[in-house]
Interface confidence: medium
């Protein structure tokens, strides 16, 4: 807390300019009118205030707007945004996409901070819905933001936003989210050639259906085991041994190390042991020779 002291004669700030950087903290507190600061917030970012001075400026704004800053001030916070706490931000009502962009720009290139997460939450709640423009903006700054959305919210994601997504941004997505994102990625990348397409679609394959995996197996894609292990179990089970061999290419040898883990374990249980033996990997647990395989799911569909 800065002590209340009278402003020295001749030091009262008439405008926010560079001369203020030579003011001591108590002088800033005493000589800068909060209302003047609020109307000239756009100048603050261009002036090289120290961190300590920024604390004083924030304190002045907090006193002027105890219920939360108006959007006209928020839009011009610039680096002062980094001084805000989530509690401060919860008092704001941010409705302009330009304001959101201006503040996200300050934190650009770094992971989402608690301040940014709170800001986005306030913005989305203020808008009442997650529209395409908002999503475009958020995925441009934080592609990983997709995995924090519900499947319902993801349904409004435009396929064009998918281009900004990096593989690591999908690490926290669960299968239900990938089920929604995969068709969008398929649409976004549909005009790419085979190998380039696979590189782009690979991280979304946790949402791919069986028929798409079968189609990929015909394209010499050499899927790595890490990707295979993230595939939907229900999509992997209908694949034949030959299809899995083609899908994995030289990586097929990795199945042995994963034979006790899903989806490999469940897939093995569905294959004929004879077919598994053709891989020469010593995979065990397939259907013994001479046994009849009944596809109960098909039977249920027929009845």
């Amino acid at each position: 807390e800065v002590e209340k002291t009278a402003c020295p004669s001749g030091k009262k700030a008439r405008e926010i300019d560079e001369s203020l950087i030579f003011y001591k903290k108590w002088e800033l507190e005493a000589c800068v009118d909060a209302a003047l600061l609020a109307t000239q917030m756009d100048r603050v970012n261009a002036i090289p205030f120290t961190y300590e001075q920024l604390d004083v400026l924030k304190h002045k704004l907090d006193e002027l707007y105890p219920q939360g800053y108006p959007e006209s001030v928020i839009q011009h916070l610039g680096y002062l945004f980094l001084k805000m706490s989530p509690e401060d931000i919860r008092k704001w009502n941010v409705t302009s996409l330009e304001t959101l962009k201006a503040l996200l720009e300050v934190n650009k290139g770094h992971e989402m901070s608690p301040q940014v997460a709170t800001l986005i939450d306030r913005f989305v709640k203020g808008r009442g819905q997650l529209d395409k423009d908002t999503l475009d903006t958020l995925t441009a700054f934080y592609p990983g933001y997709l995995c924090s959305l519900s499947p319902e919210e993801l349904s409004s994601v435009p396929p064009s936003s998918i281009w900004a997504v990096r593989p690591q941004d999908l690490d926290t997505c669960d299968p239900r989210q990938l089920d929604v994102l995969y068709p969008k990625a398929r649409l976004a990348f549909q005009n790419m050639n085979g190998s380039e397409y696979f590189v782009k679609i690979q991280s979304f394959l946790g949402g791919a259906p069986t028929e798409d995996l079968k189609a990929l197996s015909q394209q010499n894609v050499s899927m790595d085991l890490a990707t295979f292990m993230k595939l939907r179990t229900d999509a992997v089970l209908p694949l034949t041994v030959a299809e899995v061999q083609k899908l994995l290419g030289p990586h097929v040898e990795g199945l042995k190390a994963e034979e006790r883990h899903r989806p490999v374990r469940d897939w093995i249980l569905r294959q004929r042991q004879d077919d598994l033996d053709t891989l020469g990997l010593g995979l065990q647990g397939g259907i013994p020779n001479g046994y009849l395989v009944l596809d109960l799911s098909m039977q249920e569909a027929l009845s």
Epitope: E18, P48, Y79, G109
Partner: antibody, heavy 124, light 106 residues
Framework: QVKLKQSGGGLVQPGGSLKVSCAAS????????MSWVRQAPGKGLEWIGE????????VYTPSLKDKFIMSRDNAKNTLYLQTSKVRSADTALYYC?????????????????WGAGTTVTVSS | DVVLTQSPAIMSASPGEKVTMTCSAS?????MYWGQQKPGSSPRLLIY???NLASGVPVRFSGSGSGTSYSLTISRMEAEDAATYYC?????????FGGGTKLEIK
């Protein structure tokens, strides 16, 4: 490789003028605040002032405010320091220095890259 | 202006010896920065934000302190550490430097 290459300086007569240059390479010069610092013989380092990336803000240490003019040309990746009416007290090694920048673009409180220095000797 | 006073002005140490130098500020600062300067060379950043090592600086260097009192420590002196060390603040304008501590090798 990040580098600041200085030129200019030399012997200047009292009352004469001076222009020192600092050419930057190996980084995006147009993103950084740049400073000039000087060191008189046998003395410590003294900050002269700084200039922001687009030249819209130039700050000088109060005691030298009317003595120096700082400028920059981002197209040429070059920083300049000019002065006129030099005195013997201005004899020093003049350094250009880059002010560090955080990942999010906000300037830090330190100089992370320095030029090799330019010697200025004021003498008749 | 914040005046930074370094002590001692000159000191010497044997290889392998622990070295500590101090920097006292005339008013409280939030962070201190430390640099190293060898004869004929420009200054080089060693420590930023009081205790963080700059890129490429050996781990034998460390910084600490708060308020008006800060220090730089070299855990084990090496011949290449012979130089002048200066402290610097930018908690208030103008940024100021200490007068330096000249470290010599015994």
């Amino acid at each position: 490789q990040v580098k600041l290459k200085q030129s200019g300086g030399g012997l200047v007569q009292p009352g004469g003028s001076l222009k020192v240059s600092c050419a930057a390479s190996g980084f995006d010069f147009s993103r950084y605040w740049m400073s000039w610092v000087r060191q008189a013989p046998g003395k410590g380092l003294e900050w002269i002032g700084e200039i922001n990336p687009d030249s819209s803000t130039i700050v000088y240490t109060p005691s030298l405010k009317d003595k120096f003019i700082m400028s920059r040309d981002n197209a040429k990746n070059t920083l300049y320091l000019q002065t006129s009416k030099v005195r013997s007290a201005d004899t020093a090694l003049y350094y250009c220095a880059r002010r560090g920048s955080h990942y999010y673009g906000y300037r830090t409180g330190y100089f992370d890259v320095w030029g090799a220095g330019t010697t200025v000797t004021v003498s008749s | 202006d914040v005046v930074l006073t370094q002590s001692p002005a000159i000191m010497s140490a044997s290889p392998g010896e622990k070295v500590t130098m101090t920097c006292s500020a005339s008013s409280s600062v939030s962070y201190m920065y430390w640099g190293q300067q060898k004869p004929g060379s420009s200054p080089r950043l060693l420590i930023y934000d009081t205790s963080n090592l700059a890129s490429g600086v050996p781990v034998r260097f460390s910084g600490s302190g708060s308020g008006t009192s800060y220090s730089l420590t070299i855990s084990r002196m090496e011949a290449e550490d012979a130089a002048t060390y200066y402290c610097q603040q930018w908690s208030s304008y103008p940024p100021t430097f200490g007068g330096g501590t000249k470290l010599e090798i015994k």
